[in-house]
């Protein structure tokens, strides 16, 4: 038998059963995981959950830019330092780089410190381009 | 219909502060992000920074720590604050509403003159 | 800062030449690009908002197209309340920059 791969959306790439979505527009936190679910497909700022996974975005956001972190779906709602996927997946893979937590940051960010491999909490109002993901 | 109006002196002395009001009518200014931008002489234009619906600001680096933008929500207006003038900070200053990326709605603009 | 040069500095025309209008940005900004017009002691105008995506009442005259560095706007069958200056302005990062602009003028 021969089995296709899944089709992701116009300007999206695939990964691993997944379908990504890099907008270099600035939105803070909230506005951009609306954006996200807007596209439908079940959409959300992007959960990241292996090494391997996020060599592959690194990758391909290195192609566009070096120097902007980007919004990803992991957040601390109760402002409490528990950290959590917006799309449900279960924290457990972790690269947050030295200097991350701490004051009024409850949103993470990959950082373009360590070319996008890294992340960082940041407030969650700042605007920055950001990362969809979605199951096609 | 949207409307915005800037207001505020015409002419401020070198090394004093530049403040200016924008009142804005036929919109909230909960929603959407509220800018300035400026015009020199020579018609180059320099966006300064906005006040976001959520009370969030960004700045342009050009200007330091020199700006500060703020708010009142219960006059609808908004404010620009530029410290320590100098004669390069003459020019029309106008207020304009964010609709995400570019500027949709604009003030008339207001000549500020920097000079001793 | 991602700087924005438009070319040419001045364009000299008659009402109902076609023209296009040249935008290259410093570095890629995808299509986070727009463009407005000024009039002689007016507010700019929104004119096309992402590159090619029309803004109600504005003349369909007004067309935007490029991608990433390089933009176009073009003007088919200017008419005399066209003439001003032209800018274009990037939101793809902090700070927003806009072009130093095109004068379009009567020949």
């Known amino acids: 038998d021969i089995i296709m791969r899944p089709s992701c959306a116009p300007g999206w790439f695939y990964h691993k059963s997944n379908c990504y979505g890099y907008f270099r527009k600035l939105r803070n936190w909230s506005d951009a995981e609306l954006e996200c679910q807007s596209y439908g497909n079940g959409a959300h700022l992007a959960s990241i959950l292996s090494l391997k996974e996020a060599s592959t975005i690194a990758e391909y956001i290195s192609g566009y830019q070096r120097s902007q972190p980007i919004w990803i779906g992991l957040h601390d709602p109760q402002k409490r330092q528990q950290w959590q996927w917006i799309d449900g997946a279960m924290y457990l893979y972790r690269s947050w780089s030295g200097k991350s937590m701490g004051g009024n940051k409850h949103c993470a960010e990959m950082s373009s410190n360590n070319n996008f491999l890294t992340w960082s909490s940041n407030e969650c109002n700042k605007r920055q381009h950001f990362l969809c993901k979605y199951r096609p | 219909d949207v409307q915005l109006l800037e207001s505020g002196p015409g002419l401020v002395r070198p090394s004093q502060s530049l403040s200016l009001t924008c009142s804005v009518t036929?919109?909230?200014?909960?929603?959407?992000?509220w800018t300035w931008i400026r015009q020199f002489p020579g018609n180059k234009l320099e966006w300064m920074g906005y006040?976001?619906?959520?009370?969030?600001?960004e700045y342009n680096p050009s200007l330091k720590n020199r700006i500060s933008i703020t708010r009142d929500t219960s006059k609808n207006q908004f404010f620009l604050k530029l410290n320590s003038v100098t004669s390069e900070d003459t020019a029309t200053y106008f207020c304009a509403r964010e609709d995400y990326d570019w500027f949709a709605y604009w003030g008339q603009g207001t000549l500020v003159t920097v000079s001793a | 800062d991602i700087v924005l040069t438009q070319s040419p500095v001045i364009l000299s025309v008659t009402p109902g030449d076609s023209v296009s209008l040249s935008c290259r940005a410093s570095q890629s900004i995808g299509n986070n690009l727009h463009w407005y017009h000024q009039k002689s002691h007016e507010s700019p105008r929104l004119l096309i908002k992402?590159?090619?995506q029309s803004i109600s009442g504005i003349p369909s005259r007004f067309s935007g197209s490029g991608s990433e560095t390089g933009f176009t706007l073009r003007l088919n069958s200017v008419e005399t309340e066209d003439f001003g200056m032209f800018f274009c302005q990037q939101s793809n990062s902090w700070p927003f920059t806009f072009g130093s602009g095109t004068k379009l003028e009567i020949k």
């Open positions: 036929g919109n909230s200014i909960t929603s959407y992000y």
């Open positions: 006040i976001g619906y959520d009370d969030s600001n």
């Open positions: 992402y590159v090619s």
